[in-house]
């Protein structure tokens, strides 16, 4: 997260760290007791590694009573996700067992009504991704409140040049932005999960390259079918 602040500890009990061989790889969001939603591209290079999900964490390194690392029983990328596009960049991870719920571990309601979030709405994005252009990784969860950007502006030739489909949404990126390592994390608007950080190699913090998020409402049928 660029230009953000350290989050209040455990105030985002849905927040997950998707880990590869014990190190943070991507963000994720607990959407059901045994399921974490993340981004498909996160596991592209994870073929031989051990994928796990950390829940109940604020610090990645410090012991915390609520922290627990779960093995992954099943990884379900969206069937239409492809390495070379940002479209359909969703991944569902089934935990090896149901998460132990409590004040610091709780699923987040996700948007099912397939309608765009109004431009100007302030939404929270959080993650353990890099906090500066030098690539510094934080130990504690960071967050930033960003305004949603209208699709027409985001699709300008100077911005994302038509790449933002109706299944994607954008948020402003003027010095404050999601970045490398935040992919798969939640974009939360008014207590409801609206988007998932896409995992392309976009430049961060440049106002002409807004943050891109996969709209979960557009994938409600797929999410329901996997969770069923």
């Amino acid at each position: 997260i660029l230009g953000g602040r350290e989050a209040e500890a455990h105030a985002r009990p849905y927040m997950a760290s998707v880990q590869l061989n014990g190190a943070h790889l991507c963000g994720g969001v607990l959407v059901a007791e045994q399921w974490v939603l993340s981004a498909a591209h996160c596991l592209e290079d994870a073929a031989d590694g051990k994928v796990q999900v950390l829940l109940g964490a604020h610090s990645l390194s410090q012991p915390e009573p609520s922290k627990r690392l779960y093995d992954v029983l099943r990884a379900v990328p969206h069937p239409d996700s492809q390495p070379d596009t940002i479209d359909h960049d969703l991944l569902l991870l089934q935990l090896s067992e149901k998460a132990t719920l409590g004040p610091a571990v709780r699923p987040l309601p996700w948007q099912r009504v397939d309608r765009d979030v109004a431009p100007g709405t302030l939404c929270d994005v959080a993650g353990w991704g890099i906090v500066n252009h030098a690539g510094r990784r934080p130990d504690s969860l960071q967050h930033v409140l960003l305004p949603v950007l209208d699709r027409a502006t985001c699709n300008r030739r100077t911005h994302h040049d038509g790449a933002i489909t109706e299944r994607l949404m954008c948020a402003e990126s003027n010095r404050r932005d999601s970045c490398k390592g935040d992919s798969g994390g939640p974009l939360v608007c008014g207590g409801v999960l609206e988007g998932v950080v896409t995992s392309g190699s976009r430049v961060c913090g440049n106002r002409k390259k807004p943050g891109i998020y996969t709209r979960v409402a557009s994938y409600a049928a797929w999410i329901d079918s996997v969770l069923a």
Epitope: G120, L122, R175, G190
Partner: antibody, heavy 122, light 107 residues
Framework: QVHLQQSGPELVKPGASVKISCKAS????????INWVKQRPGQGLEWIGW????????YYNEKFKGKATLTVDKSSSTAYMLLSSLTSEDSAVYFC???????????????WGQGTSVTVSS | DIQMTQSPASLSVSVGETVTITCRAS??????LAWYQQKQGKSPQLLVY???NLADGVPSRFSGSGSGTQYSLKINSLQSEDFGSYYC?????????FGGGSKLEIK
């Protein structure tokens, strides 16, 4: 102690412009969105728009686009609203208010300035 | 834009009574609602955020409830300092519109 101190009352002529200020203290100015709200005499409240001092990002109610321009001076922790091409419809009390954040993504206007009265009259 | 319909527009109540003010949104606002109190000639003050949470320093006789499109503010055992106008405001999208207000007067 968070405090938003607004500039004093203004009497302006139709067609003119007026710039009102809101000086923030008691918190980190660049970390919180500042809103502006209009209240006509004996009437309700209307949201004009917000500005984020940390990046100068703004968002306006469609109704006030072209009427209000929001700016900040980070060095003095002051937000400004310029109202242009004034008419009698712009006679009102204008408030600045800070967005406070709650939980992960809820917010509300937790601190308000005392209001600036703008009277448009020839 | 989401419309916020507040009722009643005015009410006359005695000290010690209980009052309820309601606010109806034109669509689901997912508890993204605040209540404010405004005294004559003063700025509004935040009472309740996220539909049900009392702001710092607000007396416990105030309470907010509701979900979806229907919300209410309840004031138990009215005190003389509670008289004034009350406004709801949604934060689900933009613009974050206010209700028309409810003026609470002493009977």
């Amino acid at each position: 102690q968070v405090h938003l101190q607004q500039s004093g009352p203004e009497l302006v002529k139709p067609g003119a412009s007026v710039k009102i200020s809101c000086k923030a203290s008691g918190y980190t100015f660049i970390d919180y969105y500042i809103n502006w709200v209009k209240q006509r005499p004996g009437q309700g409240l209307e949201w004009i728009g917000w500005i984020f001092p940390g990046s100068d990002s703004t968002y306006y109610n469609e109704k006030f686009k072209g009427k209000a321009t929001l700016t900040v001076d980070k060095s003095s922790s002051t937000a400004y609203m310029l109202l242009s091409s004034l008419t009698s419809e712009d006679s009102a009390v204008y408030f600045c208010a800070r967005y406070g954040y709650y939980g992960s993504s809820f917010y509300a206007m937790d601190y308000w300035g005392q209001g600036t009265s703008v009277t448009v009259s020839s | 834009d989401i419309q916020m319909t507040q009722s009643p527009a005015s009410l006359s109540v005695s000290v010690g009574e209980t009052v309820t003010i309601t606010c109806r949104a034109s669509e689901n606002i997912y508890s993204n609602l605040a209540w404010y109190q405004q005294k004559q000639g003063k700025s509004p003050q935040l009472l309740v955020y996220a539909a049900t949470n009392l702001a710092d320093g607000v007396p416990s006789r105030f309470s907010g409830s509701g979900s979806g499109t229907q919300y209410s503010l309840k004031i138990n055992s009215l005190q003389s300092e509670d008289f004034g106008s009350y406004y709801c405001q949604h934060f689900w999208g933009t613009p974050p519109t206010f209700g028309g207000g409810s003026k609470l007067e002493i009977k």
